[in-house]
């Protein structure tokens, strides 16, 4: 292991799909992939009128924008469907959405805004 | 690096049942998430269902459902598929593939295909 | 259930060429599409997964893109071994879905 980066190994489990079956698959799943290759983890849901639903949440395979981030943030300002990514064990047991603000006009007093946190 | 390798041929009469297996080598198997996919000669790939070994309950397309009945023996590292009440249309490759992750992401490794011939 | 169309169901290019092929979902998959190749007689191959990232393996003059219900396929430099069908596939809600194919030939 390159020192530094967090191996992720294992990740949360979720998916929709399956529940409307009712076949309760929801718990930890094992991430494989090539030697090579960096895993991760991730959750994907919507904000429905102010209500959270998890879409799906597991092991995502190397992509860069995954790389180095120990949370599970969604940085982008209001998207149909929220994504996010990480590095580490279990990263995605929690996600927040924390839109990066296009700053125009920097103002005096910049205020960085806390990230609702979801779980 | 799993491979899947899959039962032979079968000729079976309308009306009646098919069962195909799928031996899995190369990693636990009760952690892979294995789908069935079928194609008509010359036609379009479906997909008929998939399973998690290690949670045992499959999740089935609405069009096979009741119909179809996939498992999994964690002993032998073996997913089947069973096809009842079987039709000329049934006539096809059945492939049973890995799935790159529990959620699907590509289906990555697939087994030989078991050619399925359903005629009176 | 997801319906899957692909445009052109068929075209036929040159050695060298490049070519693009577009695939719709009827509802938004997000990055749950996949692309697959297929020769006559042979179990299909997965390209490209997540909509974008390739798949070990796969020479890097393929690429795919897209995200909600629009996606793409891009083979830049056409090689021999390339004259196959593509398929793509949603992954997002069941049923799983594929497209319809698209016949590359050769010119």
């Known amino acids: 292991a390159i020192l530094g980066r967090s191996e992720t190994q294992e990740c949360l489990f979720f998916n929709a799909n399956w529940e409307k079956d009712r076949t309760n698959q929801t718990g930890v799943e094992p991430c494989y992939g090539d030697k090579d290759k960096r895993r991760h983890c991730f959750a994907t849901w919507k904000n429905i009128s102010g209500s959270i639903e998890i879409v799906k949440q597991g092991c995502w395979l190397d992509d860069i924008n995954c790389y180095d981030r120990t949370d599970c943030v969604e940085k982008k300002d209001s998207p149909e469907v929220y994504f996010c990514c990480c590095e580490g064990n279990m990263c995605n047991e929690k996600f927040s959405y924390f839109p990066e603000m296009e700053v125009t006009q920097p103002t005096s007093n910049p205020v960085t805004p806390k990230p609702p946190y979801y779980n | 690096q799993v491979q899947l390798v899959q039962s032979g041929a079968e000729v079976k009469k309308p009306g009646s049942s098919v069962k195909v297996s799928c031996k899995a080598s190369?990693?636990?198997?009760?952690?892979?998430?294995i789908s069935w996919v079928r194609q008509a000669p010359g036609q379009g790939l479906e997909w008929m269902g998939g399973?998690?070994?290690?949670?045992?309950?499959?999740n089935y397309a609405q069009k096979f459902q009741g119909r179809v009945t996939i498992t999994a023996d964690e002993s032998t590292s073996t997913a089947y598929m069973e096809l009842s009440s079987l039709r000329s249309e049934d006539t096809a490759v059945y492939y049973c593939?890995?799935?790159?992750?529990?959620?699907?992401?590509?289906?990555?490794?697939w087994g030989q295909g078991t050619m399925v011939t359903v005629s009176s | 259930e997801i319906v899957m169309t692909q445009s052109p169901s068929s075209l036929s290019a040159s050695v060298g060429d490049t070519v693009t092929i577009t695939c719709r979902a009827s509802?938004?998959?997000?990055?749950?599409l996949a692309w697959y190749q297929q020769k006559p007689g042979k179990a299909p191959r997965l390209l490209i997964y997540?909509?974008?990232s390739l798949h070990s393996g796969v020479p890097s003059r393929f690429s795919g893109s897209g995200s909600g219900t629009h996606f793409t396929l891009t083979i830049s430099s056409l090689q021999p071994e390339d004259f196959a069908t593509y398929f793509c596939?949603?992954?997002?809600?069941?049923?799983?879905?594929f497209g319809p194919g698209t016949k590359l030939e050769i010119k």
């Open positions: 593939v890995k799935d790159l992750t529990w959620t699907n992401l590509g289906l990555d490794i």
């Open positions: 190369g990693r636990e198997f009760e952690s892979l998430f």
């Open positions: 399973i998690i070994p290690i949670y045992g309950t499959a």
């Open positions: 509802q938004g998959v997000s990055r749950w």
């Open positions: 997540a909509a974008s």
């Open positions: 596939q949603q992954s997002y809600s069941t049923p799983f879905t």
